[in-house]
């Protein structure tokens, strides 16, 4: 019997016996095609599929649709691991997604859906979340029912203005709604009263850019 | 940066008047609306009054109906509640705070609280004989 060589996410990683955090080769469900994430083999459990991650400002992330779908940054700083991966991945299994922030006062706070899946890209990677529970608030900075993603060349959102070109950065925006974790990156003591920043407002209010997020996703079933 | 200052809160007995500013740095009212907020101790912070200077458009919380006037002078960049007929349940911190203009949902007329991204500091109205 050959032995299983490919990974379709960072929970069969770890179930392999690969229980160190870093960055791992991942193959797209039913297909060849790779992608490079980071493992959080340490959070609560280990077997988490970084998504997203923010830190310190280092990566652009007012990107076009395609760079949103695809993918940009580095898995071991500031990064996006692309929608069309995260769709196909979360499309076939039943995923929580679990949202870790920092504010600039030494606090932290998460956000945990117990199921997660974006739609693809037919439907504009619509954002689906069901069952929140968690520190950084009883109600969800992601608008319900989940919204289409939106970049700055591509605008899904439901308001009269362009909220990827207004707030920056792509997102599933409302009108503009209550979050935004992919907006301008502003350092401690400019970080109030931003119109752009990264936002999750049922945590920190409005007007509050975050100083880190983590977005990662697990099999609910893991 | 932008930065909205508070003024023109304190004690008044039921009945009477005040007259709060909200001076605006950093952005034009062209561009922005502006609401006051007020949050009572124990309460959730709430909507009162807004104003797009830009067409001229006003809102009002149903509480404030007929006794609150909000107005603008872009020359000033400031924004004023004049508040009239003042009750005992409208003592409560004043903020004012901004959102840009065009943040608006298709066939809405007003903003949710959480679009608001820029907030004063604060000012205590008291109503009390």
């Known amino acids: 019997k050959e032995e299983k060589t490919t990974f379709r996410d960072c929970a069969e990683i770890f179930k392999s016996g690969l229980t160190t955090s870093g960055i791992y080769t991942l193959t797209f469900p039913n297909s060849t095609e790779e992608v490079k994430a980071y493992c959080d083999m340490d959070m609560g459990g280990g077997g988490w599929t970084v998504i997203q991650h923010r830190e310190d400002g280092s990566v652009d992330f007012q990107r076009t649709w395609k760079e949103y779908k695809e993918g940009f940054g580095s898995p071991l700083g500031e990064y996006w691991l692309g929608n069309e991966f995260v769709s196909q991945l979360t499309s076939g299994h039943r995923y929580v997604l679990k949202i870790q922030l920092k504010d600039w006062e030494g606090s932290e706070a998460h956000s945990l859906y117990e199921h997660f899946y974006l739609s693809g890209e037919e439907s504009n990677y619509r954002i689906h979340l069901t069952g929140l529970t968690g520190t950084a608030g009883k109600i969800s900075s992601i608008s319900q029912p989940g919204s289409d993603f939106s970049t700055k060349d591509s605008d899904n959102d439901k308001c009269i203005c362009k909220c990827s070109q207004m707030l920056t950065g792509g997102w599933w925006f409302d009108a503009c709604g209550p979050s935004n974790l992919n907006g301008q990156y502003y350092p401690q003591k400019q970080n109030t009263n931003k119109f752009n920043g990264i936002k999750w407002y049922y945590w920190k209010g409005s007007g509050y850019s975050l100083k880190a997020t983590t977005m990662m996703i697990r099999p609910a079933d893991f | 940066d932008v930065q909205l200052v508070e003024s023109g809160g304190g004690l008044v007995q039921p009945g009477g008047s005040l007259r709060l500013s909200c001076a605006v740095s950093?952005?034009?009212?062209?561009?922005?609306?502006i609401g006051w907020f007020r949050q009572a101790p124990g309460k959730e912070r709430e909507g009162v009054s807004a104003i797009r200077s830009s067409g001229g458009s006003t809102y009002y919380a149903d509480s404030v109906k007929g006794r609150f006037t909000i107005s603008s002078d872009n020359s000033k960049n400031t924004v004023y509640l004049q508040m009239n007929s003042l009750r005992p349940e409208d003592t409560a911190v004043y903020y004012c705070?901004?959102?840009?203009?065009?943040?608006?949902?298709?066939?809405?007329?007003?903003?949710?609280?959480?679009?608001?991204?820029?907030w004063g500091q604060g000012t205590l109205v008291t109503v009390s004989s």
């Open positions: 705070a901004a959102v840009p203009a065009g943040r608006l949902r298709y066939g809405e007329q007003w903003y949710p609280i959480y679009e608001y991204d820029a």
């Open positions: 950093g952005i034009t009212l062209d561009d922005y609306a």
